[in-house]
Interface confidence: low
Amino acid sequence: EDGGPACYGGFDLYFILDKSGSVLHHWNEIYYFVEQLAHKFISPQLRMSFIVFSTRGTTLMKLTEDREQIRQGLEELQKVLPGGDTYMHEGFERASEQIYYENRQGYRTASVIIALTDGELHEDLFFYSEREANRSRDLGAIVYCVGVKDFNETQLARIADSKDHVFPVNDGFQALQGIIHSILKKSCIEILAAEPSTICAGESFQVVVRGNGFRHARNVDRVLCSFKINDSVTLNEKPFSVEDTYLLCPAPILKEVGMKAALQVSMNDGLSFISSSVIITTTHCSDGS
């Protein structure tokens, strides 16, 4: 891994990549863009899927957190031979299938889609792409679009969640590398630390949750701190304040010494969660300490 900024957030990340005929001579640039971006999402709880579309949508790599599978998925991605039409909606369908299945299996993980295309979508194909992106949103996904070369920014703004979710690359495929940092910054919601990380059993505390992207929520009033206690019960608490890099939250009162609370954050009132490796533990505190 090449150092630099990274994302420690635990969520489901779908890459939907244009492999139509028009990218034939630029597949290497697309591959290297995905490879470098993929390596920056480093949470063990982050799952990733690679989807390509042309005249059909194909899931090259199903959702996985297994780094070896991701490495193999990247190898498969490198071997892709572009050709065919730009049926972007096919790619969104492949993502929605997985999101729907995962949700119905009981997982409540946030989903982020990064879709990359070049060129303008013809009227019908734009209609289908927007419709399928809406279906992905119906299933809870946040949608970002990367447009390269001859793309139509107005179209992509309607396929993505908003104009702010579009990353235009006007200088051709070689300029893809230049947007990795901004994509990472915008799409990453991560929990880095909790202060304090040890609290007194039976006492009420406030916890500062350090991280990034907490104000990326569509509505900051729907941000919640979530504490998964001893891998069973989950308690959600409304934060006192929400800033981009920290949350101030009431911690649940944990009555026994040695209890562990894994920290999660929901951006949508507890519908889905960003997971983390941050744990708060309880300890015995004598009077006056």
Epitope: N103, R108, R135, D138, G140, N268, L271
Partner: antibody, heavy 121, light 113 residues
Framework: QVQLVQSGPEVKKPGAPVKISCKTS????????ITWVRQAPGQGLEWLGW????????SFAQKVQGRLTMTTDISTNTASMELRGLRSDDTALYYC??????????????WGQGTLVTVSS | DVVMTQSPDSLAVSLGERATINCKSS????????????LAWYQQKPGQPPKLLIY???TRESGVPDRFSGSGSGTDFTLTISSLQAEDVAVYYC?????????FGGGTKLEIK
């Protein structure tokens, strides 16, 4: 515009099978699922089953499970259903409808005109 | 199976008046992950196939007059026709698509008083 045109009325004896076709036009056939719904005389709507035109996945109502077969033919943009072992309570108007999703059975946004099936000895 | 119960069975309303049809599901059809209600409303006029009016409980299908509106969440839903027109005489059905088997309500027959 979107059209679903069903085959003509059928009169069948108990125990016989019936096959109904539903020819579609005006949209990309395998971009939507197809569902089958029936309506007994003077009664409400009863969902029978759904098929994904894209990958052939199916889902059935328990009442017709094992008796109902649904198929699609992408070359002719046609969906068909066959109901075997007909009984008198299968007498109904059978509708095909387009499902707004090709991999999950959602709501039905266009309907065929209906095919009347009469089961009588 | 999710049982859909409509009320009333039939309804007579004067032209220009408001008509309200209720639909109750035996379990919630609100999918918590996306906060959407998996419920649709259909209109069936005599001798015609049903026609989609409302999906996601409150989204009007394109071309449907804005006098038709859907509301409700979880298990209780309402179809409202704000100002009844002669062409609205029909049977109205609710349908859940939250889980298979997909199920319809028994229908509400709307007539002019």
């Amino acid at each position: 515009q979107v059209q679903l045109v069903q085959s003509g009325p059928e009169v069948k004896k108990p125990g016989a099978p019936v096959k109904i076709s539903c020819k579609t036009s005006g949209y990309i056939f395998d971009d939507y699922g197809i569902t089958w719904v029936r309506q007994a005389p003077g009664q409400g709507l009863e969902w029978l089953g759904w098929i994904s035109t894209y990958n052939g996945k199916t889902s059935f109502a328990q009442k017709v499970q094992g008796r109902l077969t649904m198929t699609t033919d992408i070359s002719t943009n046609t969906a068909s259903m066959e109901l075997r072992g007909l009984r008198s309570d299968d007498t109904a108007l059978y509708y095909c409808a387009r499902v707004f999703s090709r991999y999950i059975p959602f709501y039905f946004d266009s309907w065929g005109q209906g095919t009347l099936v009469t089961v009588s000895s | 199976d999710v049982v859909m119960t409509q009320s009333p069975d039939s309804l007579a309303v004067s032209l220009g008046e408001r008509a309200t049809i209720n639909c109750k599901s035996s379990q919630s059809v609100l999918y918590s992950y996306n906060n959407k209600n998996y419920l649709a409303w259909y209109q069936q006029k005599p001798g015609q196939p049903p026609k989609l009016l409302i999906y996601w409980a409150s989204t009007r299908e394109s071309g449907v007059p804005d006098r038709f509106s859907g509301s409700g969440s979880g298990t209780d839903f309402t179809l409202t026709i704000s100002s009844l027109q002669a062409e609205d005489v029909a049977v109205y059905y609710c349908q859940q698509y939250y889980s298979t088997p997909l199920t319809f309500g028994g229908g509400t027959k709307l007539e002019i008083k």
